[in-house]
Amino acid sequence: CDLPQTHSLGHRRTMMLLAQMRRISLFSCLKDRHDFRFPQEEFDGNQFQKAEAISVLHEVIQQTFNLFSTKDSSVAWDERLLDKLYTELYQQLNDLEACVMQEVWVGGTPLMNEDSILAVRKYFQRITLYLTEKKYSPCAWEVVRAEIMRSFSSSRNLQERLRRKE
């Protein structure tokens, strides 16, 4: 499955939206910094099957969508920008889902290794736990927004490697 060019554009637009969403300076939130143990190894590997890479990308986008579509998120961010973010993420999920169906099932057998997906889930679980502990404060959301940008940046690198493999 070839990811459409629009997927890369959507990814870029998502990064721009996340950047525009910033409400306060990260420098004023230094005391709230947190290491979420981003699973970098899941985004570095050239050892990835294409199916696995697509599934990891899908999981990152799905978890990002879930994170920003909570009640607490809608209070924290500009509604107009959030709506645009949902649209971008939803489109990317659709692009990837079409690919997942083609790549993951070959001859009726699933090729997915769940380990990478679980690493992504544990990472997002730490993010949601952090937000809960910080009572969804503006600084906590700002730290999380910056962290999601970082994870999207790594996702982009994985996408680029996927494109080069095609």
């Epitope: 143990r37 999981e59 879930n66 380990d115 679980l118 690493a119 889930r121 544990k122 949601t128």
Partner: antibody, heavy 122, light 107 residues
Framework: EVQLVQAGAEVKAPGESLRISCKVS????????ISWVRQIPGKGLEWMVK????????IYNPSFQGHVSISVDKSITTVYLQWSSLQASDTAIYYC???????????????WGQGTLVAVSS | DIQMTQSPSSLSASVGDSVTITCRAS??????FHWYRQKPGKAPELLIY???NLQTGVPSRFTGSGSGTECTLTITSLQPDDFATYYC?????????FGQGTKLDVR
């Protein structure tokens, strides 16, 4: 086949130290949280602590924090629960459990060890 | 901590009967409710996760429902194996907590 195999029963005196183990096999060790659950004989279940074997990130039940510690040895896919000074009230069965984590980030305990009975008595 | 209260605490029934066990949480736990069965002398085993999902290998006689602060476990056509203690659990907030258990015995 997923297996969590726990060490045998232990009889200890108050004040002694103890480390019990849970050897896992049948899946990628670093992919799933592991928890310990206590059951005092004839009583209910209490969650104690969980650990991510990937980087030893831990979350404790405040009721147990400071009294027990959890650790892992990735090289032998084993999780440990340790006491530096046992009390009679630590007498219980201790279960290690594997967590599954759904896409909506719901934890549940999908595989349990057979349990280790710890008896603390003078 | 989120308190989990099961009712009834004990229950008598016969093979072939249907029974329902209820679990109430002291605050909303969404669908982060799970049910376990513990046979005497054995480790607990997962029956239902996320309020209503049947764990692989568990017979369809077990059904779970509910969300928010209340969920129920229903067992239809009781089998001899089902006489055991049942626990609900929440994993919505730390610390994770269990109900006190419901002992199901033979009438």
């Amino acid at each position: 086949e997923v297996q969590l195999v726990q060490a045998g029963a232990e009889v200890k005196a108050p004040g002694e130290s103890l480390r019990i183990s849970c050897k896992v096999s049948g899946y990628t060790f670093t992919s799933y949280w592991i928890s310990w659950v206590r059951q005092i004989p004839g009583k209910g279940l209490e969650w104690m602590v969980k650990i991510d074997p990937r980087d030893s990130y831990t979350i404790y039940n405040p009721s147990f924090q400071g009294h027990v510690s959890i650790s892992v040895d990735k090289s032998i896919t084993t999780v440990y629960l340790q006491w530096s000074s046992l009390q009679a009230s630590d007498t219980a069965i201790y279960y290690c459990v594997r967590h599954y984590l759904t896409q909506s980030l719901v934890d549940y305990f999908d595989h349990w060890g057979q349990g280790t009975l710890v008896a603390v008595s003078s | 901590d989120i308190q989990m209260t099961q009712s009834p605490s004990s229950l008598s029934a016969s093979v072939g009967d249907s029974v329902t066990i209820t679990c109430r949480a002291s605050q909303s736990v969404s669908n982060y409710f799970h049910w376990y069965r513990q046979k005497p002398g054995k480790a607990p085993e997962l029956l239902i996760y996320s309020a209503s999902n049947l764990q692989t290998g568990v017979p369809s006689r077990f059904t779970g429902s509910g969300s928010g602060t209340e969920c129920t476990l229903t067992i239809t056509s009781l089998q001899p194996d089902d006489f055991a203690t049942y626990y609900c659990q929440q994993t919505h907030g730390y610390p994770f907590t269990f109900g006190q258990g419901t002992k199901l015995d033979v009438r």
